[in-house]
Amino acid sequence: NIDVCKLGTVTVQPAPVIPLGSAANISCSLNPKQGCSHYPSSNELILLKFVNDVLVENLHGKKVHDHTGHSSTFQVTNLSLGMTLFVCKLNCSNSQKKPPVPVCGVEISVGVAPEPPQNISCVQEGENGTVACSWNSGKVTYLKTNYTLQLSGPNNLTCQKQCFSDNRQNCNRLDLGINLSPDLAESRFIVRVTAINDLGNSSSLPHTFTFLDIVIPLPPWDIRINFLNASGSRGTLQWEDEGQVVLNQLRYQPLNSTSWNMVNATNAKGKYDLRDLRPFTEYEFQISSKLHLSGGSWSNWSESLRTRTPEEEPVGILDIWYMKQDIDYDRQQISLFWKSLNPSEARGKILHYQVTLQEVTKKTTLQNTTRHTSWTRVIPRTGAWTASVSAANSKGASAPTHINIVDLCGTGLLAPHQVSAKSENMDNILVTWQPPKKADSAVREYIVEWRALQPGSITKFPPHWLRIPPDNMSALISENIKPYICYEIRVHALSESQGGCSSIRGDSKHKAPVSGPHITAITEKKERLFISWTHIPFPEQRGCILHYRIYWKERDSTAQPELCEIQYRRSQNSHPISSLQPRVTYVLWMTAVTAAGESPQGNEREFCPQGKAN
């Protein structure tokens, strides 16, 4: 709040703008008849230094010259870059109570002369764009610095534009508002940037360019594709381009891909035939343009065209599996399962599957279409049956896949040996086996089939399977494998007309079960105790249960309990024990064991056998 210097003046030598590292002398002078009213000799002029409106120093000790009561000169040094405010105040020393009165103030700017601008780069976006140049201004000057961009061209044409940098804005780019037409393709242009501020000036080196050097074509627009005869693999890509474009680059990829197919097209005139597209696939297409075969810059990529190629008839064969269940003495239920074709084989939306069951000798044929990936029929148990399935989309059907219906586990000689299941990691299980020892006929293929061992899984969930060539003896199963779940795994060996299988349980990761089995009843029969239990709920098993343990001890005894270990079988839910004394009260409980350890004990039951013990 300086009152426009009524009391006096402040001047700076050599100037209010000084280079970094320089000193300045600030003189504060009172106007005639101004000052302390009664005692001019008591006038004391003080100089205060402010940075960002904060008082940082009283320069009382920097006084280099003093006309008592009239003027004082102060030397200021070590000023930092930017602006510093100095305020001169009058202190009437006879009046201690009155604060010093502002006389006048001055701002000193400290900065540097501009460096020559460097790295000039000019562009004109499109044939109708304007020339814009950018440059590197070098070190910040901390002063208002004016920049002039000057362009010189053929016929001595020149033009220029100006801007400035200060502490609020930076000037390192200017648009000249000039458009260079293509008929200047051979001409040379020169640009130069000049920087000037209160401490000096500098000029860039001249930067020379041609039309082709700086004109970046606009990206192509209005991109579209026409599929020849609704083909899913061939299409003509079309687009609009600026008139002078001679070279295009096309890139396209399926939407889920990570690598582009690239094509260069010379004199395409907005049209290019593509012949290697995948049917029924979402594609992304982009195009870039260039004005000259050897020189010039590529345009930015166009906006993406996203479209799906048309369908074509399915290729490839379905992977089929089946289950057989006898219903009564003359009927069996056949459940067929198949895996969906992958997109590159389906080549369209699969509308339905054509399923055929045929009795080979009597020529009985059952046919149906379904939209599901399974089909169940009841057929006679007699005769040799074969099944076939094909997939259909809007353009046609795949070749049918045939499979002979045999008794999958009917031939013991075909059963694979030494089947093992090892957990590889959280998501898969490695199954290995040895071939059947005395197979009558050659193994055509192995099928590894697995299903979660949970209630109702046979009826609720289709099986998972892998087809393995006959010379392979291992399979890594991962589809729908979850940790802490026990799977029944079957390895089938199939010949032309027979099948044999071996079964094993396995898990990909295991923990000790959460709880033990629940003893539901203890009954005494013929001097033996039968312990009955309910199995541990499926979510609490946490892997494959290897065996159960039945513990017992005399009530109130502190001795170690006795135990009996039973191999786990799903179908078993009772077991006899016969080493208990009659008319002694026992406490019994059970635990379950996985490969990771033993569960906590289940419920305790007390029982006092009545009969005679062994």
């Epitope: 304007t130 061209g153 053929p154 016929n155 001595n156 044409l157 020149t158 033009c159 220029q160 534009k161 100006q162 508002g177 000039i178 458009n179 260079l180 037409s181 008929d183 200047l184 001409s187």
Partner: nanobody
């Protein structure tokens, strides 16, 4: 809206002088190319002289060098063409053009490059 208004045309004897003016309105005058063009009946429009208002560079057609002078008055937003030693070949409609925003190989002489045009003023030399 930019408007260019020419004045100062008329009839004059061979060897005489005329001074054409072009008043620009609705227009930022600095750092622009402004030019004078002429078109005789049945002929193409040709560049006579041009000036760059940002730096004072001037350009002249060979046929008028040393006879015509182009100048400007920034304060009045006005462009001038002083024509001395006029000949019957100088007879034409004279147009004022402003803002050379598209550079062709003809440079300042190419009328396609200018953004704004006046209605013209007739000069007849007998």
């Amino acid at each position: 809206q930019v408007q260019l208004q020419e004045s100062g045309g008329g009839s004059v004897q061979a060897g005489g002088s005329l001074r054409l003016s072009c008043a620009a309105s609705g227009y930022t005058y600095s750092n622009r190319h402004m030019g004078w063009f002429r078109q005789a009946p049945g002929k193409e429009r040709e560049g006579v002289a041009a000036i760059y208002t940002g730096g004072g560079s001037t350009y002249y057609a060979d046929s008028v060098k040393d006879r015509f002078t182009i100048s400007q008055d920034n304060a009045k937003n006005t462009l001038y063409l002083q024509m001395n030693s006029l000949t019957p070949e100088d007879t034409a409609m004279y147009y004022c053009a402003a803002d050379l925003t598209r550079w062709y190989s003809g440079g300042w002489r190419d009328p396609r490059g200018y953004k704004y045009w006046g209605q013209g003023t007739q000069v007849t030399v007998s």
